[in-house]
């Protein structure tokens, strides 16, 4: 799925308006990414509990297990993002898969992801049938990681 | 930084050409995202070795430590992506931070990230000063996670 761009539209003050209203399917087809998180969403109960499974997706087998929460904005590309939510404060023991080990912390790994917002073009609200894509950095938690607690010097 | 889009350019067969060649700085300013990985790149030696540090960024404190490898494509948005490369096959012990524990595997977490490629518009190579942004899913490894080995049923 591709979007045709006028060369220079990123900086020239003028671009020609289009002749018709864009059907919603077109924008959403272009803006919607894979609507799945890095790991398939697990609908089994253990994906929401503080334990490390011996099967299933990575987020439920991790000793720092997490669930995924949807973040949806139809005016953003990609429209769906997923945030990792840690299910335990500490890491789960590799031996038992259930008891927490206070020697390890389960912490989210954050990332500033590049996203684009559909916006009215600056200074021409309502005057033209065109829009701008605004590049932004958007903070998402990608996963939860088992780390050794930080020792302050 | 925003890019002006003609409404309808995502699906209409024609869009007006611009009157001038876009300066390279404009595309790069728009396409370049934050050129940093989720965690600051560590230039100390331990970030490249199989051990869990007690300080430094998350990827070096993790018991499934990883390093970041740059993937740069000037015709892609974002132009810089980072791939996580696991530094250990097994998880590092929480007690020692150095010895590996065979009960846990250190595995990459993969994600199909939305990216955009600058392409000549279909069927009009060289005829107009415009280009298309093609949305693609691109596989990146986000981090390395300590998991319990999968038990096959």
């Amino acid at each position: 799925v591709s979007l045709r761009i006028q060369e220079g539209c990123s900086h020239l003050p003028s671009c020609c308006p289009s002749k018709e209203q864009e059907p919603p399917e077109e924008w959403l087809k272009w803006s919607s990414a894979s609507v799945s998180p890095p790991e398939p969403l697990s609908h089994t109960h253990h994906a929401e509990s503080c334990r490390a499974s011996k099967d299933g997706p990575l987020n439920s087998r991790a000793i720092s297990p997490w669930s995924y929460e949807l973040d949806r904005d139809l005016n953003r590309v990609p429209q769906d993002l997923y945030h990792a939510r840690c299910l335990c404060p500490h890491c789960v023991s590799l031996q038992t898969g259930s008891h927490m080990d206070p020697l390890g912390n389960s912490v989210p790994l954050y990332h500033n992801q590049t996203v684009f917002y559909r916006r009215p073009c600056h200074g021409e609200e309502g005057t033209h049938r065109r829009y701008c894509l605004e590049r932004r950095l958007y903070r998402v938690s990608l996963a939860c990681v088992c780390v050794r607690p930080r020792v302050m010097a | 930084v925003s890019l002006r889009i003609q409404e309808g350019c995502s699906h209409l067969p024609s869009c007006c050409p611009s009157k001038e060649q876009e300066p390279p700085e404009e595309w790069l300013k728009w396409s370049s995202a934050s050129v940093s990985p989720p965690e600051p790149l560590s230039h100390t030696h331990h970030a490249e070795s199989c051990r869990a540090s007690k300080d430094g960024p998350l990827n070096s404190r993790a018991i499934s430590p990883w390093s970041y490898e740059l993937d740069r494509d000037l015709n892609r948005v974002p132009q810089d992506l980072y791939h996580a490369r696991c530094l250990c096959p097994h998880c590092v012990s929480l007690q020692t931070g150095s010895h590996m524990d065979p009960l846990g595997n250190s595995v990459p977490l993969y994600h199909n990230q939305t990216v955009f490629y600058r392409r000549p518009c279909h069927g009009e190579e060289g005829t107009h000063r415009r280009y298309c942004l093609e949305r693609r899913l691109y596989r990146v490894s986000l981090a390395c996670v300590c998991v319990r080995p999968r038990v096959m049923a």
Epitope: Q21, E22, P24, E25, W27, L28, K29, V35, E69, L70, D71, R72, D73, L74, N75, R76, L81, H83, Y117, R118, R119, P120, E125, H128, R129, R130, Y131 | E7
Partner: antibody, heavy 125, light 108 residues
Framework: QVTLRESGPALLKPTQTLTLTCTFS??????????LGWIRQPPGKALEWLAH???????HYKPALKSRLTISKDTSKNQVVLTITNVDPVDTATYYC?????????????????WGQGTLVTVSS | EIVLTQSPATLSASPGERVTISCSAS?????MYWYQQKPGQAPRPLIY???NLASGVPARFSGSGSGTDYTLTISSMEPEDFATYYC???????????FGQGTKLEIK
Amino acid sequence: QVTLRESGPALLKPTQTLTLTCTFSGFSLSTSGMGLGWIRQPPGKALEWLAHIWWDDVKHYKPALKSRLTISKDTSKNQVVLTITNVDPVDTATYYCARMGQLHYYGYDYAMDYWGQGTLVTVSS
Amino acid sequence: EIVLTQSPATLSASPGERVTISCSASSSVSYMYWYQQKPGQAPRPLIYRTSNLASGVPARFSGSGSGTDYTLTISSMEPEDFATYYCQLYHSYPPTWTFGQGTKLEIK
């Protein structure tokens, strides 16, 4: 012309399950970007959003009520159903269904552009 | 969860008067939406995306604001404008719609 109509029981007893149906016409819930939500308003109080369902069957719920709410759609019947389990007198309210999905040149609006007339539900022992 | 606080809760005004209703968000948001509700009726959209008038809404209504502070203004009150007004926002994570507690506009 877009219309929405809510239907459901006027009176329930505490602990019962409330099932509300929104029947709509003039648009399709299978159209990309379209969504339908439920909002309630206790007598003399403010509007409170409860749940939302999108064209692609993605569902959202008010976090504080999530465990009690279920929203579903039947696109062929042009209906959306909301169930609320274990009702209490504080659930007494006028329940509205409303549409969201207006695309402008600048993008989608997250306002509810069409509303039903509402149905009053009383929970009392 | 973002909280919307409207002020004042009640406002008395006379026909012809200029009226301003405020809506404050507990954290920064991109856009605000406004509705009018009359007794026994469903809410009616007034303002889309902070400042765009909904279809059929008279030009005496306007919206403005950014960040955490948003305003609905009625430049010259008409008798039919006496009603309750609500601000509303959409938050993408977690996806939720939130309404303000309402401002009741009464005849002085």
